[in-house]
């Protein structure tokens, strides 16, 4: 079943079939027995009840108000009323562009990355049974595709695919021919793939310290805007009042990525701060990477190879 019309503000193009479907439609048992009314108000007119006699272009079916077709003077507010249920829409009918196969104000824009999967399918489920044929146009030139019921493009995007794609459905109703147009503005952009965030420096760092002094552990990374950099230490971060995570610093690189730096400040170093892991983690949509710092008493430095130290 076609979804109900939940958007309160709707813009449509003159000369096309159009419908409003209220959202209490599935209460079918109530619908049979309950009085239902559709109203329109516009400008000076207040709440005029609609029925097929109002206009030869209007049809009412159960849950739906149909226009065959919608015209500029259909602009206004529409109401559906059933018992204590009311639904309201504001309809704005705009002029068709007579010099193009589509109207610019009724275009859906999509951005597709080059080499990524790109798909356009021409479907219209509500009018499906009435559609005789459907054509797909690119920049108003008809594309020759096998399926003339639901023309489809499925491919990996190339820059040449950029353009305006219009699905035009042709249908008959009461002996008249109508068409419905849906247009997509497809923009093909460079691959915007995220970089794999990189933690700078060695994965394991032994830092020589003196008891009672302070130390600043600097964790730096090259990352994407969404990526997170944080410190993990002890059972529960924040349990040691002498440990402070400083505000993260970020600088944008010329390539549009970020150089981030986050310092962990340990004041008045005590025995409990020695020989434990202080982990700095960068997390991205691709996963995590971690580097570790271990504080070692200066007197114990001789036991550890020189190349693992940071000062």
């Amino acid at each position: 079943a076609e979804s109900c019309t939940s958007r309160p503000h709707i813009t449509v193009v003159e000369g096309e079939p159009f419908y409003l479907k209220h959202c209490s439609c599935s209460l079918a048992h109530e619908i049979e027995t309950t009085t239902k009314s559709w109203y329109k108000s516009s400008g000076s007119q207040e709440h005029v009840e609609l029925n097929p006699r109002s206009s030869s272009r209007i049809a009412l079916h159960d849950c739906v108000l149909e226009f065959w077709p919608v015209e500029l003077n259909d602009t206004g507010s529409y109401f559906f009323q059933m018992k204590n249920y009311t639904q309201k829409w504001k309809l704005n009918v705009i002029r068709r562009n007579k010099h193009s196969c589509f109207t610019e104000r009724q275009v859906t824009s999509k951005i597709v990355e080059v080499k990524k999967f790109f798909q356009i399918t021409c479907e219209n489920s509500y009018y499906q049974t009435l559609v005789n044929s459907t054509s797909l146009y690119k920049n108003c030139k008809k594309l020759l595709l096998e399926n003339n019921k639901n023309p489809t493009i499925k491919k990996n995007a190339e820059f040449e695919d950029q353009g305006y794609y219009s699905c035009v459905h042709f249908l008959h109703h009461n002996g008249k021919l109508f068409n419905i147009t849906k247009t997509f503005n497809i923009t093909i952009v460079e691959d915007r793939s995220n970089i794999v965030p990189v933690l700078l420096g060695p994965k394991l760092n032994h830092v020589a310290v003196e008891l009672g002094k302070n130390v600043r552990l600097n964790c730096s990374a090259l990352l994407n805007e969404e990526d997170v950099i944080y410190w993990m230490f002890g059972e529960e971060n924040g349990s040691d009042p002498n440990i402070h995570e400083e505000k993260e610093m970020r600088i944008m690189t010329p390539e549009g990525k970020w150089h981030a730096s986050k310092v962990l400040r340990i004041e008045n170093i005590g025995e409990s701060n020695l020989n434990v892991l202080y982990n700095c983690t960068v997390a991205s949509t691709g996963g995590t990477d971690t580097k570790s710092f271990i504080l070692v008493r200066k007197a114990d430095m001789a036991d550890i190879p020189g190349h693992v130290f940071t000062r």
Partner: antibody, heavy 115, light 113 residues
Amino acid sequence: QVQLVQSGAEVKKPGASVKVSCKASDYTFTTYGISWVRQAPGQGLEWMGWISAYNGNTNYAQKVQGRVTMTTDTSTNTAYMELRSLRSDDTAVYYCARGWYFDLWGRGTLVTVSS
Amino acid sequence: DIVMTQSPDSLAVSLGERATINCKSSQSVLYSSNNKNYLAWYQQKPGQPPKLLIYWASTRESGVPDRFSGSGSGTDFTLTISSLQAEDVAVYYCQQYYRTPYSFGQGTKLEIK
């Protein structure tokens, strides 16, 4: 078509191990981490852990730490989740999901642990 | 670990009416460096995997109807369905991806009144 295809249902005895696979197609496998999420019958979603496809780094939830191993094979774009020492409360549908907000899910693999 | 708590556990709303689901995190999931909230919303129907609706707390996933919207920041978040349709009957989950272990709310079952 961008998708994650999981291996079929498994029935295991308590104490046994199970290894579920998740094959990715039509996207750059190493760009996204793979999370494993399980759902016991009639229950909510439980995050088990994830693996970075680009470097193999893992993070496991405390509840399954020590019993779970997550791996990837970048040559086949496949992620694996092995759960050992199975118990009856491990009976669940196991899903793999992409990224850190999960915009792509496998269909799920039902693992039944029963004696 | 960050604990996510949803309210209510279940909800019955009339067709065409507004449905609101709340989610509270035990600590902030707002990252000050980029001002993003690391929170997502999912919809799950019986026998199906969850489906992503909203990420970064308020960004609608492509293809998700615009009646679904997300709001909130820090620790308090809301998923709103502006005009409930029959096909929206499902269980809805929030999830934080700010810190591992990533965690879900317990779920909210949405039904038609």
